[in-house]
Amino acid sequence: KTLVLGKEGESAELPCESSQKKITVFTWKFSDQRKILGQHGKGVLIRGGSPSQFDRFDSKKGAWEKGSFPLIINKLKMEDSQTYICELENRKEEVELWVFKVTFSPGTSLLQGQSLTLTLDSNSKVSNPLTECKHKKGKVVSGSKVLSMSNLRVQDSDFWNCTVTLDQKKNWFGMTLSVLGFQKASSIVYKKEGEQVEFSFPLAFTVEKLTGSGELWWQAERASSSKSWITFDLKNKEVSVKRVTQDPKLQMGKKLPLHLTLPQALPQYAGSGNLTLALEAKTGKLHQEVNLVVMKVAQLNNTLTCEVMGPTSPKMRLTLKQENQEARVSEEQKVVQVVAPETGLWQCLLSEGDKVKMDSRIQVLSRGVNQT
């Protein structure tokens, strides 16, 4: 028995070959012996049943001369999954058609971090097929009647070429995924105390009309609980602020990419935030983490102190030195001090490996008065 795979809604070609490689009488039937179509010697295609009943069934008249009498079934339905019989030259050939339906749950337009389940449904009780989907960038996902893609990323967007294999027979179909998300999962902003702060949240996709709502929650390092800094709506790509905290005095841009500014980086703002964006007609939310690290350098009571506040990595080093001189103190911690510093220009550096994340300078005056 020959096996043919077909996808619901598409076409399938069931083979039937003459050993003589020339035109001959043939008939295609269902397994219950009802005639579908055939050729009875005059080179004319004869259809069984009413025209509306079998209007999806056809053959390739151009192939008859070569001894090929395929049955073409268009607009495949799940109920077409059955055994078909081709009668010619006093023999019968059985062809089994396996029609499968592909469903994508929750759909092919998803949010970053969500999962996609691809399911093959069929009426026939076939053994497990192999389903394999390959992205144009090379990523391959495989399964059987159920194929899962978890924690989708923006890079997973675009066309996937999928193959269903059963008993060495293959059928291809494509799917176009659209994974909506931010360009970066998280970002860190390093600022000296008093500097202006800008946070940007660029999206990794473009749509003509983008509608939804969002909020930025902030967990300051020095605070016991998080606080909603701003809530906003997004309508046709226009951002409108709904509610904003009075401290800090935040401003938000009215057009994409989402953009927020703080007039000053202050120690009490150092910490991390989570911007969430809920898009209309989508379940779930997009998230982007943003971190603010603030450096403060001050001279008090004959002690020069450099401190960083906010989420730093344990590998980061804080260095306090007089400009153009060797490091006076350099430690893997968030505060460094020099007692009785010499007069002159001092520099504090926050670095990770050989990369300087930020630096701040302070002028130490002889009278113990400081000038940043």
């Epitope: 702060v197 309508k235 046709n236 226009e238 401003q251 938000m252 009215k254």
Partner: antibody, heavy 119, light 107 residues
Framework: EVELLESGGGLVQPGGSLRLSCAAS????????MSWVRQAPGKGLEWVSG????????YYADSVKGRFTITSDNSKNTLYLQMNSLRAEDTAVYYC????????????WGKGTTVTVSS | AIQMTQSPSSLSASVGDRVTITCRAS??????LGWYQQKPGKAPKVLIS???SLQSGVPSRFSGSRSGTDFTLTISSLQPEDFATYYC?????????FGQGTKLEIK
């Protein structure tokens, strides 16, 4: 060519009301954000109010909030500014301006209509 | 609201001079700033949008730039028709705010 024509200005007593209109031609009104900008005699430009293309979002300068209302009628391609509780400091030439497709700038301006608030 | 501080308020210059006008924003406003020219009795006209995009029909002697929250309009070689009042406008967020204006006069 896109044209904006303001009307409705005039002399009004303090505490009175006026409604300014801005008729637009040569554009699909609902596509663009619109603004009202004013200029007091011998002074600089002051942005007064704005409305999104859909008409869903409206915005005001602090100096007019609660007294002025911006609306639009897309079927008439007309922008309005309802001015209530007028004060002497509202005396100015009022311009209506159309914003670019992506709110990039005010690319088309009307010639202005004069509002005088005086007793 | 975001404050825009424009300087100088007035400026005397001669034809052929290079002139710069600056605006400082009280908050970061990305590149969401435009420059407008206004002549007496006329409506303003946009010269530059988004910090540095020259509008069609505007002579190339006009240019715009940004450094942090400082924005600059430069006229490389003043022409007689350039004597006017110039304004910056932040359209980063509502309420929009104009600078106080710079009146450019013939020396």
């Amino acid at each position: 060519e896109v044209e904006l024509l303001e009307s409705g200005g005039g002399l009004v007593q303090p505490g009175g009301s006026l409604r300014l209109s801005c008729a637009a031609s040569g554009l699909t009104f609902s596509t663009f954000a619109m603004s009202w900008v004013r200029q007091a005699p011998g002074k600089g430009l002051e942005w007064v109010s704005g409305i999104s293309g859909s008409g869903e979002n409206t915005y005001y300068a602090d100096s007019v909030k609660g007294r002025f209302t911006i609306t639009s009628d897309n079927s008439k391609n007309t922008l309005y500014l309802q001015m209530n509780s007028l004060r002497a400091e509202d005396t100015a030439v009022y311009y209506c301006a159309k914003e670019g497709y992506n709110w990039n700038y005010m690319d088309v301006w009307g010639k202005g209509t004069t509002v005088t608030v005086s007793s | 609201a975001i404050q825009m501080t424009q300087s100088p308020s007035s400026l005397s210059a001669s034809v052929g001079d290079r002139v710069t006008i600056t605006c400082r924003a009280s908050h970061g406003i990305r590149n969401d700033l435009g420059w407008y020219q206004q002549k007496p009795g006329k409506a303003p006209k946009v010269l530059i949008s988004e910090t540095s995009s020259l509008q069609s029909g505007v002579p190339s002697r006009f240019s715009g730039s940004r450094s942090g929250t400082d924005f600059t309009l430069t006229i490389s070689s003043l022409q007689p028709e350039d004597f006017a009042t110039y304004y910056c406008l932040q359209d980063y967020t509502y309420p929009y705010t104009f600078g106080q204006g710079t009146k450019l006069e013939i020396k």
